[in-house]
């Protein structure tokens, strides 16, 4: 007789990632009877909300409801109606909202209040909106990738499927790059974590993990660019900024008020004799790299070793998954292949940045000019951050894996966040042997 599919006994969860540049909604699904197994939760949908990040709605909060509508309606379509009331919805806001809160707690609260009001009007089990800490963002990203790679289970489940999977239970480190912050999280080898703020202890599936994590606020790719511009305009002789991080022939007018809007540029703020200046691209990787390095203060370190700005960083250990903007930027530049050495990446960046703006636009006609113009900076910034910021070398570069998805689920903090809030990662190893994935009899 033919196998018949049993009625699906599944659960769903929704997490909204309210990032600095945009919001994404993720829908997760898992078999109800296997909640405590590692690796059974998977992403079934990602919906990118049209528009900027929620922190940009500070002067127009009444538009937040409309902004969220399309993706929330999409969730209503994807998740069966009978499941709506028991589907939890979580919204986590990251560094864009951390920065807004630094400027004004009242304005940040106002935005979050309207977000909560709006999301409460949907038929799901809304569990609240909050600004997650940088430490949480790093930790949940680390949990996500290791959960998806099967690192917490007794047998490595997707060993043959994931190309960068090594046949051992050593966890991957997590490198996350956003628009406003960047996180580095990994298990150091027999090294005491000298700074308590950077130490996390987890017990997952019966095993203890001592994890190092740090989130560098203002060192996401967008805020790093604002920092660099604010630093460079200080020494400009007039309102022309010849910038090596943009393609030759590129021109853009920047308002000084926009430059100093973010708390990230406060340290470079000065009274300028003009309200606007023009960026003129000169497209030189080496000079761009040098300019970026000036954002990292490496002259002061109160620990045995530091990343930059006096932040403790233990010696790098093992393989790392680099995701979010690390992946998107390197993917665009066609540099995510395991075979591309660090020297080759640098070579390609030199070539890419020196390409004229006209030629670049012709090569990528479908890419929005705003994004296209920033890939030279972003690619150079990634190299600078990984090599000089985090002390990767040409050798250890081979241990960085640029990851977009693992088994169809996006690498990022959202899955780890949901797994934690729904208590789906047990401290102890479940006693029962995990069932197979099949729902057929």
């Amino acid at each position: 007789t033919q196998n018949k599919a049993l009625p699906e006994n599944v659960k769903y969860g929704i997490v909204l990632d309210a990032g600095s540049s945009h919001t994404s909604l993720y829908i997760y699904k898992w078999p109800a009877e296997k909640e405590n197994d590692t690796g059974v939760v998977h992403q079934v949908e990602e919906c990118r909300v049209k528009g900027p990040g929620i922190s940009k709605f500070v002067q127009k909060v009444n538009e937040i409801g409309i902004y969220l509508t399309d993706c929330m309606e999409r969730a209503r379509e994807v998740i069966p109606r009978s499941q709506h009331q028991e589907t939890p919805v979580y919204l986590g806001a990251t560094a864009g909202m951390r920065l807004l809160r630094m400027e004004s707690e009242e304005l940040a609260d106002r935005v979050l209040d309207v977000v909560e009001r709006s999301l409460s009007n949907y038929p799901f089990d809304f569990q609240g909106a909050r600004i997650i800490t940088g430490q949480e963002e790093g930790a949940y990203g680390w949990i996500t990738i290791n959960y998806l790679l099967g690192k917490f289970s007794q047998k490595t489940r997707w060993f043959s499927i994931v190309p960068y999977e090594t046949n051992n239970q050593e966890t991957f480190g997590a490198l996350d790059l956003g628009g406003a912050s960047t996180q580095v999280t990994f298990v150091p080898q027999n090294q005491t974590i000298e700074s308590p703020d950077n130490a996390l202890q987890f017990r997952l599936y019966g095993k203890d993990y001592n994890v190092y994590t740090h989130s560098f606020l203002c060192y996401g790719k967008d805020q790093a660019l604002w920092q660099k511009l604010a630093k460079d305009i200080q020494v400009a002789s007039n309102e022309i900024l010849r910038d090596p991080c943009f393609h030759p022939g590129y021109k853009k007018v920047v308002n000084v008020s926009d430059l100093y809007k973010t708390p990230c540029t406060k340290r470079f703020e000065m009274t300028l004799p003009f309200q606007q200046f023009e960026i003129q691209g000169i497209g030189n990787y080496q000079q761009c790299h040098q300019s970026i390095l000036e954002l990292f203060n490496t002259s002061y370190c109160p620990y045995s070793q530091c990343a930059f700005n006096g932040i403790f960083l233990p010696p790098l250990q093992g393989d790392f998954g680099a995701f979010s903007a690390f992946y998107f930027v390197m993917k665009f530049l066609n540099l995510t292949s395991e075979k591309v050495s660090q020297e080759k990446v640098t070579e390609m960046m030199k070539k890419f940045c020196s390409k004229s703006w006209e030629e670049t636009k012709t090569s990528y006609p479908s890419v929005k000019e705003k994004y296209l113009s920033e890939y030279c900076f972003s690619g150079t910034y990634i190299l600078s951050l990984l090599l000089q910021g985090y002390h990767f070398t040409a050798d250890s570069w081979e241990h960085i894996h640029f990851i977009g998805k693992i088994q169809g689920s996006d690498a990022g903090w959202t899955l780890g966040y949901m797994l934690n809030l729904t208590n789906m990662i047990p401290a102890e190893q479940p006693l029962s042997t995990p069932l197979s994935h099949s729902t057929y009899v």
């Epitope: 209040d113 909560e116 809304f126």
Partner: antibody, heavy 120, light 113 residues
Framework: QVQLVQSGAEVKKPGSSVKVSCKAS????????ISWVRQAPGQGLEWMGG??????NYAQKFQGRVTITADESTSTAYMELSSLRSEDTAVYYC???????????????WGQGTTVTVSS | GIVMTQSPDSLAVSLGERATINCKSS????????????LAWYQQKPGQPPKLLIY???TRASGVPDRFSGSGSGTDFTLTISSLQAEDVAVYYC?????????FGGGTKVEIK
């Protein structure tokens, strides 16, 4: 010191609508989240919905039957309840405060209440 | 939504004695970002609107006598009147303001024995 003053008592027929107003004085109205709470005779308190920063939301029970609006120019919030039935006979209160972000201190200021009687 | 369950329904206490009211929420109202419990207590006398007594589970609202105190965290909360006075005869409600929809407990009527 913020004060909330509500409109007077109303007697309504079943099937009709009622609109209750709540005028704020002594504070910046645009940053006041206003909740509406009702209390049937001899019963407890029941939250109906609220408005804050231009966005309203409602308890599931009243969804589709209640509309909460605010007019910043007059510092007044309104609660309109349609398709009235006898069970809607209650005292309707407006109060300052919402959830988490909009109501950090709970509902700290209350209107005097508006009695709505629904009877044929 | 979050269900608030109050006990007892009514309570008769002698003047000067302690009155204790319990409130349980169906899920935690403790907000991890600031470690505060989003729970309030109200007093309502006949013919009057409710009056805020306690917010953040344990902080007295301005002008509230110090015989009123709130305690508890997560899902279990208590309102205590350390020495009952005649003017304390009223109905007391707990309310969570952690998430929409806002929800109240069923109320506890406090009378003098």
């Amino acid at each position: 010191q913020v004060q909330l003053v509500q409109s007077g008592a109303e007697v309504k027929k079943p099937g009709s609508s009622v609109k209750v107003s709540c005028k704020a004085s002594g504070g910046t109205f645009s940053s006041l989240p206003i909740s509406w709470v009702r209390q049937a005779p001899g019963q407890g308190l029941e939250w109906m919905g609220g408005i804050g920063f231009g966005t309203a939301n409602y308890a599931q029970k009243f969804q589709g039957r209640v509309t909460i609006t605010a007019d910043e120019s007059t510092s007044t919030a309104y609660m309109e309840l349609s398709s009235l039935r006898s069970e809607d006979t209650a005292v309707y209160y407006c109060a300052r405060g919402g959830a988490k972000y909009a109501g950090r201190y709970g509902m700290d200021v209350w209107g005097q209440g508006t009695t709505v009687t629904v009877s044929s | 939504g979050i269900v608030m369950t109050q006990s007892p329904d009514s309570l008769a206490v002698s003047l000067g004695e302690r009155a204790t009211i319990n409130c349980k929420s169906s899920q935690s109202v403790l907000f991890s970002s600031n470690n505060k419990n989003y729970l309030a207590w109200y007093q309502q006398k006949p013919g009057q609107p409710p009056k805020l007594l306690i917010y953040w589970a344990s902080t007295r609202a301005s002008g509230v006598p110090d015989r009123f105190s709130g305690s508890g965290s997560g899902t279990d909360f208590t309102l205590t009147i350390s020495s009952l006075q005649a003017e304390d005869v009223a109905v007391y409600y707990c309310q969570q303001y952690y998430l929409y929809p806002l929800t109240f407990g069923g109320g506890t009527k406090v009378e003098i024995k």
